[in-house]
């Protein structure tokens, strides 16, 4: 079983644990080329990559963020684009320039005394996708800097659910914890029968939904206790 | 800004102690698994140990089980590696490494030597 | 363990011209949660990794884009559309599916 394998730390045996790393997985684990290691680096130009495609804000410029170029347009092709001034519309606090952040879909002052109190439960690390997004300098750091993300998206790392955006939970992902999906009617889920009766849970399922609860699939009564599907199924 | 740093490398005699830290920095470090990872002189790299998130659960490869203690600090950000019965073999650079969003350090110097 | 096997070992390029690199792994490095969990790293001499591509063929940040990373399964290609003398060094595939974490066994690029 995968209990007596960790137990007897037997490594080989299991299951993924990136990194990773990268972590992540990482998910394993690292920086990319010239940015983890500030100095006389070919890969810390950028200048000469323009427009800059990137997969998330913290890869873009202070005064960028990321998106598709065109409203629509296809996810996977992203650039660094410039950032929204006051007033403009916005989605996400990294869209407004620095000094401002999203409130209501528009770019706001953050120089507000109720901004930190307004927004402060929804900082997490909501980088989205599993790589380094070291730039070299520091980022999102003050509150003049875009420190304030929204909830975390799925694959961001989180410490508890609530850390999360809706309909997503944080679970266990190799050695990490991560923003995963609320499960849905028909999934598969994970039924503690006692709590400590389980061995370590590398790849954590969230719990089922809500109106729904984790219970054996019904034409798997006759199949044998080990092997007991369970699904998430209305109450 | 996000970075892991190495300390505690040096030059210390076969079967003596050294504590190795990794200070991380820029990211929610309690919310990563962490690892060790090293490499030895004109040589490949090599994995040494894991720890999860919260610190309960770790792992090591067999050429160090028994000697080396991987540890984390999630209150001070930093990560640990206590090795013990140091041997010639572990003679190495070596990096602290974030999971899932790939991280690492730029390694410290462990030369053990008589 | 997964034995990860890079071809060639050794690789010399006339600046302007391609490269590729291969690497192999022992089982699959598709994780069941949609990724594959292959890296590509440039190590220089006295130098840190410096990772270059991750989850087979995402590009880290601030990396050029004439580096790009392919394959699926097994079988994996970092490939350098147009080498450049800051590109030598020892390129080496990384994969973090399976503790422990498993290395090629590196391919030094050389200028001609």
């Known amino acids: 079983t995968l209990n007596s394998v960790l137990n007897s730390n037997a490594i080989k045996n299991l299951p993924p644990p990136l990194g990773g790393a990268a972590g992540h997985p990482g998910s394993a684990v690292s920086a990319a080329p010239g940015i983890l290691y500030p100095g006389g680096n070919k890969y810390q130009t950028i200048d000469n990559y323009q427009p800059y495609p990137c997969a998330e804000d913290e890869e873009c410029g202070t005064d960028e963020y990321c998106a598709s170029p065109t409203r629509g347009g296809d996810a996977g092709v992203q650039i660094c684009l410039a950032c929204r001034k006051r007033r403009k519309r916005c989605m996400r606090h990294a869209m407004c320039c620095p000094g401002n952040y999203c409130k209501n879909g528009i770019c706001v002052s953050s120089d507000q005394n109720n901004f930190r109190g307004e927004i402060e439960e929804t900082i997490t690390e909501s980088f989205g996708n599993d790589h380094s997004t070291l730039d070299g300098y520091s980022r999102r750091t003050t509150l003049s800097s875009k420190m304030y993300h929204s909830k975390g998206q799925e694959g961001s790392v989180c410490l508890r659910s609530s850390d999360c955006a809706t309909g997503l939970c944080c679970a266990r992902h190799f050695w990490s914890k991560i923003c995963k999906p609320v499960l849905k009617e028909g999934q598969v889920c994970t039924k503690h029968r006692r709590k400590g009766s389980h061995g370590l849970e590398i790849f954590q399922r969230c719990y089922c939904g809500e109106g729904l609860s984790c219970r054996i699939q019904k034409d798997h009564h006759q199949a044998s206790n080990s092997s007991r599907l369970h699904t998430c199924q209305r109450h | 800004q996000v970075q892991l740093v190495e300390s505690g490398g040096g030059v210390v005699q076969p079967g003596r102690s050294l504590r190795l830290s990794c200070a991380a920095s820029?990211?929610?470090?309690?919310?990563?698994?962490m690892h060790w990872v090293r490499q030895a002189p004109g040589k490949g790299l090599e994995w040494v140990a894991v720890?999860?998130?919260?610190?309960?659960?770790?792992y090591y490869a067999d050429s160090v089980k028994g000697r080396f203690t991987i540890s984390r600090d999630n209150a001070k950000n930093t990560l640990y590696l206590q090795m013990n019965s140091l041997r010639a073999e572990d003679t190495a650079v070596y990096y602290c490494?974030?999971?899932?969003?790939?991280?690492w350090g730029q390694g410290t110097l462990v030369t053990v030597s008589s | 363990d997964i034995v990860m096997t890079q071809t060639p070992l050794s690789l010399s390029v006339t600046p302007g011209q391609p490269a590729s690199i291969s690497c192999k792994s022992g089982?699959?490095?598709?994780?069941?949660?949609?990724?594959?969990?292959l890296y590509w790293y440039l190590q220089k001499p006295g130098q840190p990794p410096q990772f270059l591509i991750y989850?087979?063929?995402n590009r880290f940040s601030r990396v050029p884009d004439r580096f790009s990373g392919s394959g699926s399964g097994t079988d994996f290609t970092l490939r350098i559309s147009r080498v450049e003398a800051e590109d030598v060094g020892i390129y080496y595939c990384?994969?973090?599916?399976?503790?422990?974490?498993?290395f090629g066994q590196g391919t030094q690029v050389e200028i001609k």
């Open positions: 490494a974030r999971e899932l969003r790939v991280l």
């Open positions: 820029g990211f929610t470090f309690s919310g990563y698994g």
């Open positions: 720890i999860s998130y919260d610190g309960n659960d770790k």
């Open positions: 089982q699959s490095l598709l994780h069941s949660d949609g990724k594959t969990y």
């Open positions: 989850e087979v063929s």
């Open positions: 990384m994969q973090s599916i399976q503790l422990p974490w498993t």
